[in-house]
């Protein structure tokens, strides 16, 4: 009696199940009580000796090529012996790598939680996935994995970690690059300070007296309020950032405590008030002010 | 098939601006870097900067700084280079390149776009 | 600012023998990350310039294999092994390693 080994399907992709079936065309495995035993190359596969004549592999890999064969074994025991089959595994090459973050849209708080997922739409076996940071790439990262996803953290972002990234993904075919992707660091302004500049030391009556606010930190656009006593002067925006000044034609009601704040949608601060006095040096016709 | 396509010849009057584009089509115009050279006539190549169309932020040569501004229309996939104040020695033919990052080379150029400055 | 000086600056071939062409960096141009971006370009005539070599030894796809770059540090080298008639125009070398990016003055390569 002659035993053939029969592998379903014969040319595998990785990852997928196989079928072993030891096959006897002139005897029928129910005439005798047979054995099947399932060898690799030089090796016993799965429980050894076993009245199946069928063996399922979940998953074959590309470590998984070789040389295959069967026994079959009667009662009687004799032994029969198929011929060798090459099974080849056949890898997919990555493809269509792409990298995405989260928070989606690449923004983030200053601070917050930074993930950038590096994803391939498809590739088999152990996947290199690289993450590099600037168009000139710093490798931040490698992992190797199982899988057509892999994840890098920054736990807590930095201003200094908006810039260009991009990853790669690589399974023995050759490196592929994901796009770019730009992260935004999204910084809360910082509390104000507020400048009062006067044209002379001693400004008068009908001086043109300049408020100057500024957050030294913060991402733009920043918009500034001015008050005075808690009474809103006006506003002025600082699109690109950086500070922002408010005119004021100063009458003897402009005495007290001035203020300002910055607000960039991510929080507001306030700055310390300046206060604003009237005085009248001797000998002087007109009024004076002094901060 | 990834293309840069880029406008037609100029002549300016020195002290004029000139605004060059660059309109990509054939791959994701948000994925990779555009970088801008130029070359005067007879002459060698000349980096000027570039710009990430992703999120429109430019990096300039400074010898360029305050002259030239790099910018990008995601909506139309196309990329500027505007350069101000002109002078004779600026005329040149102006390239736009994408450039591959990982591998880092410039893959595909525009056919080149030639400014001339003259009175 | 890094220059990149080339030399011969002009090269009068002869098809089928070889040529080599010289490439010097003003200073190291290996960047933090370890890598060396040094790319050779030829530039045709009336076309604009086309990839050869990147990253000082790789042959982009489609480049055939009588052209191989080699070096290191500052120093760097441009060989065609067998050069043919439609190797004939403008060779440059570039780094991107140091901003500003800069281009050698281009060695020119002609038929005898």
């Known amino acids: 009696a002659e035993l053939f080994l029969i592998a379903s399907p014969s040319h595998p992709t990785e990852g997928s199940p196989v079928t072993l079936t030891c096959k006897m065309p002139f005897l029928q495995s129910s005439d005798a009580q047979f054995q099947f035993c399932f060898f690799r190359d030089t090796r016993a596969l799965g429980p050894g000796w076993s009245s199946s004549p069928k063996l399922q592999i979940a998953a074959m890999w590309k470590e998984d090529t070789g040389s295959y064969w069967c026994e079959a074994q009667t009662m009687a025991s004799k032994v029969l012996r198929s011929r060798r089959s090459q099974i080849n595994v056949h890898r997919v090459p990555v493809a269509d790598v792409s990298l995405e973050t989260q928070p989606p849209g690449g923004q983030v708080m200053e601070g917050d939680r930074l993930v950038l997922i590096c994803s391939v739409a498809m590739g088999t076996g152990d996947i290199t996935f690289l993450w590099y940071k600037g168009a000139v790439g710093l490798n931040l990262q490698s992992k190797t994995q199982r899988s057509l996803t892999a994840e890098y953290e920054i736990p807590s972002v930095r201003e200094s970690d908006a810039e260009q990234y991009y990853c790669v993904a690589e399974n023995g075919y050759g490196p592929s690059p994901s796009g770019l992707v730009s992260i935004t660091v999204r910084i809360p302004v910082s509390r104000p300070i507020l400048m009062l500049r006067a044209p002379r030391a001693q400004a008068a009556v009908e001086d043109v007296l300049e408020l100057h606010c500024e957050a030294l930190r913060g991402s733009p656009p920043i918009l500034y309020w001015f008050y005075h006593e808690d009474i809103t002067l006006g506003s002025r925006s600082a699109p690109s950032g950086g500070g922002a000044s408010f005119n004021l034609s100063l009458t003897e009601e402009h005495s007290g405590n001035y203020s300002c704040e910055a607000n960039n949608g991510l929080g507001a601060q306030r700055s310390e008030a300046v206060t604003l006095n009237f005085t009248v040096p001797t000998g002087a016709r007109s009024n004076h002010l002094t901060s | 098939q990834v293309q840069l396509v880029q406008s037609g010849a100029e002549v300016k009057k020195p002290g004029a601006s000139v605004k060059v584009s660059c309109k990509a089509s054939g791959y994701t115009f948000t994925s990779y870097n555009i970088h801008w050279v130029r070359q005067a006539p007879g002459q060698g190549l000349e980096w000027m900067g570039w710009?990430?169309?992703?999120?429109?932020?430019?990096k300039y040569n400074e010898k360029f700084k305050g002259r030239v501004t790099i910018t990008a229309d995601t909506s139309t996939s196309t990329a500027y280079m505007e350069l101000s104040s002109l002078r004779s020695e600026d005329t040149a033919v102006y390239y736009c390149a994408r450039r591959i990052h990982y591998y880092d080379y410039f893959d595909y150029w525009g056919q080149g776009t030639l400014v001339t400055v003259s009175s | 600012d890094i220059v990149m000086t080339q030399s011969p600056l002009s090269l009068p071939v002869t098809p089928g023998e070889p040529a080599s062409i010289s490439c010097r960096s003003s200073?190291?141009?290996?960047?933090?990350?370890?890598?060396?971006?040094l790319e050779w370009y030829l530039q045709k005539p009336g076309q604009s310039p086309q990839l050869l070599i990147y990253?000082?030894?790789n042959r982009f796809s489609g480049v055939p294999d009588r052209f191989s770059g080699s070096g290191s540090g500052t120093d760097f080298t441009l060989k065609i092994s067998r050069v043919e008639a439609e190797d004939v125009g403008v060779y440059y070398c570039f780094q991107g390693s140091h901003v500003p990016w800069t281009f050698g003055q281009g060695t020119k390569v002609e038929i005898k």
């Open positions: 990253k000082v030894s």
């Open positions: 710009i990430y169309p992703g999120d429109g932020n430019p």
């Open positions: 200073q190291s141009i290996v960047h933090s990350n370890g890598n060396t971006y």
